[in-house]
């Protein structure tokens, strides 16, 4: 006769361990289903009912994994102006931000936005920096606009932002000196990629 398949939750035989994708719940004293990576235990198992799993809600990730699944969902980090997403968040990892390199910017606080290139102007009214697009005067920039219009960048918060570090070749770290005034555009230098 084939061995009887035990369905979770079940009490393990003395001295035996729970199977793959299961964990021993100390409270229930039963073998219960583990939640898949990126899911969390919405309801823990009891002697009569198995673990109820759920994914973290959109914009959140699993910040603390335990054997029974995710114990803590947390909101994804948002990259602040002057920084863009270097590594997107996943079900089990947070967003990583990186400074916008010279010639690129981000003026949002976002968990998805990457650094975008400054628009290229025929005549620059205000140079772009890490947290602001370039402002063009007169004739149209690369991104299509009405002739003769002045393109104003999307306003950022009035708060001052991080002064941006300057990227340099990866043989040696770059140096960024922080002035007591508001941020200035990063010095144009080798991007070191």
């Amino acid at each position: 006769l084939p061995a009887q398949v035990a369905f979770t939750p079940y009490a393990p035989e003395p001295g035996s361990t729970c199977r793959l994708r299961e964990y021993y719940d100390q409270t229930a004293q039963m073998c219960c289903s583990k939640c898949s990576p990126g899911q969390h235990a919405k309801v823990f198992c009891t002697k009569t009912s198995d673990t109820v799993c759920d994914t973290c809600r959109p914009g959140w990730y699993c910040a603390l994994s335990k054997q029974e699944g995710c114990r803590l969902c947390a909101p994804l980090r948002k990259c602040r102006p002057g920084f863009g997403v270097a590594r997107p968040g996943t079900e089990t990892s947070d967003v990583v931000c990186k400074p916008c390199a010279p010639g690129t910017f981000s003026n949002t606080t976002s968990s998805t936005d990457i650094c975008r290139p400054h628009q290229i102007c025929n005549v620059v009214a205000i140079p772009g920096n890490a947290s602001m697009d370039a402002v063009c005067t007169s004739t149209s920039p690369t991104r299509s606009m009405a002739p003769g219009a002045v393109h104003l960048p999307q306003p950022v918060s009035t708060r001052s932002q991080h002064t941006q570090p300057t990227p340099e070749p990866s043989t040696a770290p770059s140096t960024s000196f922080l002035l007591p005034m508001g941020p200035s555009p990063p010095a144009e230098g080798s991007t070191g990629d």
Epitope: R159, H162, S170, P173, L178
Partner: antibody
């Protein structure tokens, strides 16, 4: 579990160079999600952030303006550590120096979550 | 630089008390503020990040609130191990700056 172990002399003569090292275990100095900081603490100035180094496809350094002309923070990928050099020290630089890991550079949730044990550095002849 | 002003600089309280510490930034820092606890001879320890989020493993008697320039840190029902110095820290703008600290002593 991340651990930071500091080493370096506790006594430096005025005008000389203060050099400290912070050895990392449980993370990598070239991690794409951490930054490596030096912070000092003295009774007169409280906690003072000095600077940081971090890697995001390339290395970045940020320094505070008050020590900008005297400070260097360098990563050492072969030994998985980073160092602080502070030149031309004066008795004003006497403090407990801490290395610290920063999580979340450039984003929300940006904080110092792991610290070294601290090194009291006295500048005196 | 952004100045962080903590008050009071020291306070005395008893086990079981509720204590509140305030931190004021010299300009708007949104909610980019963290709170740390430091015991003598030890490094600071993160308690609260982004003004109101409790760090994993930190007891729920600790809490934080505020946004913009005014922030509050509260300990409900003080425990003997809570007597220490507490610091706020802003990361809205470089250089990162700390408050001068609030020393919490046993009454």
């Amino acid at each position: 579990q991340v651990q930071l172990q500091q080493s370096g002399p506790g006594l430096v003569k005025p005008s000389q160079t203060l050099s400290l090292t912070c050895a990392i275990s449980g993370d990598s100095v070239s991690s794409d999600s951490s930054a490596w900081n030096w912070i000092r603490q003295s009774p007169s100035r409280g906690l003072e952030w000095l600077g940081r180094t971090y890697y995001r496809s390339k290395w970045y350094n940020d320094y505070t303006v008050s020590v900008k002309s005297r400070i260097t923070i360098n990563p050492d990928t072969s030994k998985n550590q980073f160092s602080l050099q502070l030149n031309s020290v004066t008795p004003e630089d006497t403090a407990v120096y801490y290395c610290a890991r920063e999580d979340g550079v450039g984003g929300t949730k940006d904080y110092f979550d792991y610290w070294g044990q601290g090194t009291l550095v006295t500048v005196s002849s | 630089d952004i100045q962080m002003t903590q008050s009071p600089s020291s306070l005395s309280a008893s086990v079981g008390d509720r204590v509140t510490i305030t931190c004021q930034a010299s300009q708007d820092i949104s909610n980019y503020l963290n709170w740390y606890q430091q015991k003598p001879g030890k490094a600071p320890k993160l308690l609260i990040y982004d003004a109101s989020n409790l760090e994993t493993g930190v007891p729920s008697r600790f809490s934080g609130s505020g946004s913009g320039t005014d922030f509050t840190f509260t300990i409900n029902s003080l425990q003997p191990e809570d007597f220490a110095t507490y610091f706020c820290q802003q990361y809205d703008n470089l250089p990162i700056t700390f408050g001068q600290g609030t020393r919490l002593e046993i009454k």
